[in-house]
Interface confidence: low
């Protein structure tokens, strides 16, 4: 079927247009284009014969036509009126007639548009904004951008006038956009310059800072206000209402307490003629004097006195606080404070509580520390000690005995021999002693503030022969892998050699065996079993020699894991089980039993008669040492056959 | 700061009735839609309905329609959700979220932490 | 009604990976050549949060690693690589015409 295509078929104004036919009969004699819809000898535009190859135009013929001998139609500089149907009547040889229409639109290339608004400084949340896309244009789309966005939905936003016109209502400063508008038709598509809405708004509510609305007398005080607002605001202090200056800071150098009052900032908009006004009340206070401690006793006794320290001076309304040690006050029922914080009261004194002390008065900048404050507890004295703790002396050599006691004030010392007093010094020097210098030898220590007397007697002997020692030890049941033992050679005698002996043998090499102390203390670490041995130890001068008595070292091990006798696993059935647990173990485990999981009995051995398929499963021995809280276990697993299904074992 | 606050869940028998409160702060209601959205359990998120508090449109999904009512009221900056006729496939956490220009810029930006109704016999 | 579908249903990854959620709509989201679909994350017992809005616009307070794309019909969710608190459900949601609806969600649990 005859054809015509329009290429393009929106063709711009200027440009060209070509109506291509399709399917084109053969055998043609000529062929005619009208404009319009019909054929219409009025309208005729172009005729071409074939057999001449003759054009001839028609009354609509412009000029800008071109006929092509496969009756395509080129039409140059298209014009506006060229717009509309076109209609190709071919006649072929036999002068049949066919005829097609074809047709195409012409549109302006359209001009970069404008936009014309109707309020260049609309004020916020009270006017409208009317843009309009210039020139209004026939055929033409009008399409609106916001910051190079499309626009979003809004119920602010209205469009109207076939979308030339673009309505912002009660705008908002977030308003404040490029704005662009878009033309568009098929031929073309331009778009406009930036607009940008500049909107009139605030001031709002000024901001003023800093924040803090406390000063020091003597500070500098230094306001700033601050308001959103277009165009920027101007801006006014008053202080307690009364007006100060026009400027967006306000300095006062030095302040005092008569500054304190209500600051307001007014920022005032020309443009929307608002003003705004924050207040912020400052108070100034004076300072405050330096606290210092009072103290109702200044040489409290240990575990007798109570001591109360006071923080001065008294003010009203003031927050008293207490460090120990520059520490806040601890948790203690032996520190007290009063309801207002002032007093602070220690019940029963002791020695660790000399401090130092501090309290502090708060106001509303900062605290304020007192001086440190130390206090004199008076104790002791303790029970003194006496040294060198040696015990026994040859004859011939110096006796040299220091005592001590921890006391304040310091202890006055007395020694004493077999109760009778010697001197009053904290030393005791006695030369070449003989056996006749053997007794009780007593130190009493004496505090003359708190009255108070301790005495320690230590059993001198001097003798040329050494005692029989002993051992002593620090842990009588020590455990396998765990424990270290320290053994100890008593007594500690002067210029005295120590030697020690295991299963009376000479001690081994061993990096778990330590002497110290003189050789005087032995120490096993991490013992094993293989430890329970018979140890002793000696002691010898260039005199005498002797031994002590072996001591046996109990080591609690275990339990290892059980061994379960006899070792089969298989049984015919009617036989008798018996299963025998043991474990190694010190002291002895306790056993008990359990069958596929089910608790049996707590004995060593296990007896169950005449046996069936039904004693089949898991046997399972557990251990447990009470001394160590160790455990252990080990499963066996027991068959019992049918007899003579299998040649199993009896047992 | 926006906040959200819903309230008046509970248990409730099949075929009672509910009403849920959402209390908004921090903005305006009037300038926003106000939506609500539930959640059944171990499902995902269903729109339920929203009202524009400025002039009282409303609109609802076809789950609740002529069943639910969505009412504001701006002296109180709150909205409403009006449940009857209610069933077990109801039974939800209901969430409520302001959308619009303003707000939220066209996206449920603030959610309130959610009311849970159980309907059960 | 647009409905949307999420997929996929489930996806499992380590932390350090890149994750890429995909909603599609049955008809165009689109109003001005801009996509009406926004994502919504939700952890358990919690409220869902939005993540990015109109397609590919980050919501206040989201990290970078999230970003949306698309446009018409087909919209990604995409996070750059996953850190231990991105597991959850993620939801799509159009809102171009009522009534406003969700996609049915896709749970990023850990691999």
């Known amino acids: 079927k005859l054809t015509i295509e329009s290429t393009p078929f929106n063709v711009a104004e200027g440009k060209e247009v070509l109506l291509l036919v399709h399917n084109l009969p053969q055998h043609l004699f000529g062929y005619s284009w009208y404009k319009g819809e019909r054929v219409d000898g009025n309208r005729q535009i172009i005729g071409y014969v074939i057999g001449t190859q003759q054009a001839t135009p028609g009354p609509a013929y412009s000029g800008r036509e071109i006929i092509y001998p496969n009756a395509s139609l080129l039409i140059q500089n298209i014009i506006q009126n060229d717009t509309g149907f076109y209609t190709l009547h071919v006649i072929k040889s036999d002068l049949v007639n066919e005829e097609a229409t074809g047709q195409f639109r012409v549109y302006p290339e359209l001009p970069k548009p404008s936009i014309s608004s109707n309020n260049s400084k609309p004020v916020e949340d009270k006017d409208a904004v009317a843009f309009t896309c210039e020139p209004e244009t026939q055929d033409a789309t009008y399409l609106w951008w916001v910051n190079n966005q499309s626009l979003p939905v809004s119920p602010r936003l209205q469009l109207s006038n076939g979308n030339r016109t673009l309505t912002l209502f009660n705008v908002t400063r977030n308003d404040t956009a490029s704005y662009k508008c878009e033309t568009q038709n098929p031929v073309s598509a331009r778009r406009s310059d930036s607009v940008i809405l500049n909107v009139l708004y605030g001031p709002d509510a000024p901001t003023i800072s800093p924040l803090n609305t406390s000063y020091r007398s003597g500070e500098n005080l230094n306001l700033s206000c601050h308001a959103a607002s277009n165009p920027p605001a101007q801006y006014s202090w008053f202080v307690n209402g009364t007006f100060q200056q026009s400027t967006q800071e306000l300095f006062i150098p030095n302040i005092t307490v008569n500054n304190s009052g209500s600051y307001t900032c007014q920022a005032h908009n020309s443009d929307t003629g608002l003003n705004r006004t924050t207040v912020t009340t400052i108070t100034v206070y004076a300072e405050p004097p330096k606290p210092f401690i009072t103290s109702n006793n200044s040489n409290p006794v240990e575990d007798e006195d109570a001591v109360a320290l006071t923080c001065e001076p008294e003010i009203q309304n003031t927050t008293y606080l207490w460090w120990v040690n520059n520490q806040s006050l601890p948790v203690s029922p032996r520190l007290q404070l009063s309801n207002d914080n002032r007093t602070l009261t220690l019940l029963s004194v002791t020695r660790n509580d000399v401090g130092p002390y501090e309290c502090g008065i708060q106001n509303e900048l900062s605290v304020d520390h007192s001086d440190p404050v130390i206090l004199n507890v008076l104790y002791g004295p303790d029970d003194p000690t006496i040294s060198p703790s040696y015990t026994y002396y040859r004859p011939g050599v110096n006796l040299s005995l220091s005592c001590h006691a921890a006391s304040n004030p310091p202890a006055q010392y007395s020694w004493l021999i077999d109760g009778n007093i010697q001197q009053h010094t904290q030393e005791l020097f006695i030369s070449n002693i003989t056996e006749k210098n053997s007794g009780l030898y007593t130190c009493q220590a004496n505090n003359s503030a708190s009255g108070h007397s301790r005495t320690t007697v230590k059993t001198i002997t001097v003798s040329a022969e050494l005692p029989k020692p002993s051992i002593s030890s620090n842990n009588s049941k020590p455990v396998e892998d765990k424990d270290a033992v320290a053994f100890t050679c008593e007594p500690e005698a002067q210029n005295t050699t120590y030697l020690w002996w295991v299963n009376g043998q000479s001690l081994p090499v061993s990096p778990r065996l330590q002497l110290s102390n003189g050789n005087r203390t032995l120490t096993l670490f991490n013992v094993t079993r293989n430890d329970a041995r018979a140890y002793v130890c000696g002691i010898q001068n260039s005199v005498s020699a002797n031994r002590s008595d072996p001591v046996t070292l109990d080591v609690l091990y275990g339990p290892d894991t059980p061994i379960i006798s006899p070792p089969d696993s298989s049984y015919l059935s009617g036989a008798n089980l018996n299963l025998s647990c043991h474990s190694a173990s010190n002291p002895s485990p306790q056993y008990s039993w359990r069958i596929n999981g089910i608790p049996q009995q707590h004995t060593q051995v296990l007896f169950i008669a005449k046996i069936t398929p039904n004693n089949n499963g898991t046997y399972a021995c557990f251990v447990s040492n009470l001394a160590t809280g160790r455990n252990n276990s080990i499963v066996k697993s027991i068959t019992v056959s049918a007899s003579g299904t299998s040649p199993g074992l009896s047992a | 700061e926006v906040q959200l606050v819903e309230s008046g869940g509970g248990l409730v028998q099949p075929g009672g009735s509910l009403r849920l409160s959402c209390a908004a702060s921090?903005?305006?209601?009037?300038?926003?839609?106000m939506h609500w959205v539930r959640q059944a359990p171990g499902k995902g998120l269903e729109w339920v309905g929203r009202i524009d508090p400025a002039n009282g449109n409303s609109k609802y999904a076809d789950s609740v329609k002529g069943r639910f009512t969505i009412s504001a009221d701006t002296s109180k900056n709150t909205a409403y959700l009006q449940m009857n006729s209610l069933r077990a496939e109801d039974t939800a956490v209901y969430y409520c979220?302001?959308?619009?220009?303003?707000?939220?810029?066209?996206?449920?930006?603030?959610w309130g932490q959610g009311t849970t109704v159980t309907v059960s016999s | 009604e647009i409905v949307l579908t999420q997929s996929p249903a489930t996806l499992s990854l380590s932390p350090g990976e890149r994750a890429t959620l995909s909603c599609r709509a049955g008809e165009s989201v689109d109003i001005f050549g801009v996509g009406f679909l926004h994502w919504y994350q939700q952890k358990p017992g919690q409220a869902p949060r939005l993540l990015i809005y109109?397609?590919?616009n980050r919501a206040t307070g989201i990290p970078a690693r999230f970003s949306g794309s698309g446009s018409g019909t087909d919209f990604t969710l995409t996070i750059s690589s996953l850190e231990p608190e991105d597991f959850a459900v993620y939801y799509c949601q159009q809102t171009n015409e009522d009534p406003y609806t969700f996609g049915q969600g896709t749970k990023l649990e850990i691999k």
């Open positions: 921090g903005f305006n209601i009037k300038d926003t839609y």
């Open positions: 979220a302001p959308f619009g220009y303003y707000v939220s810029d066209y996206a449920m930006a603030y």
């Open positions: 109109r397609g590919s």
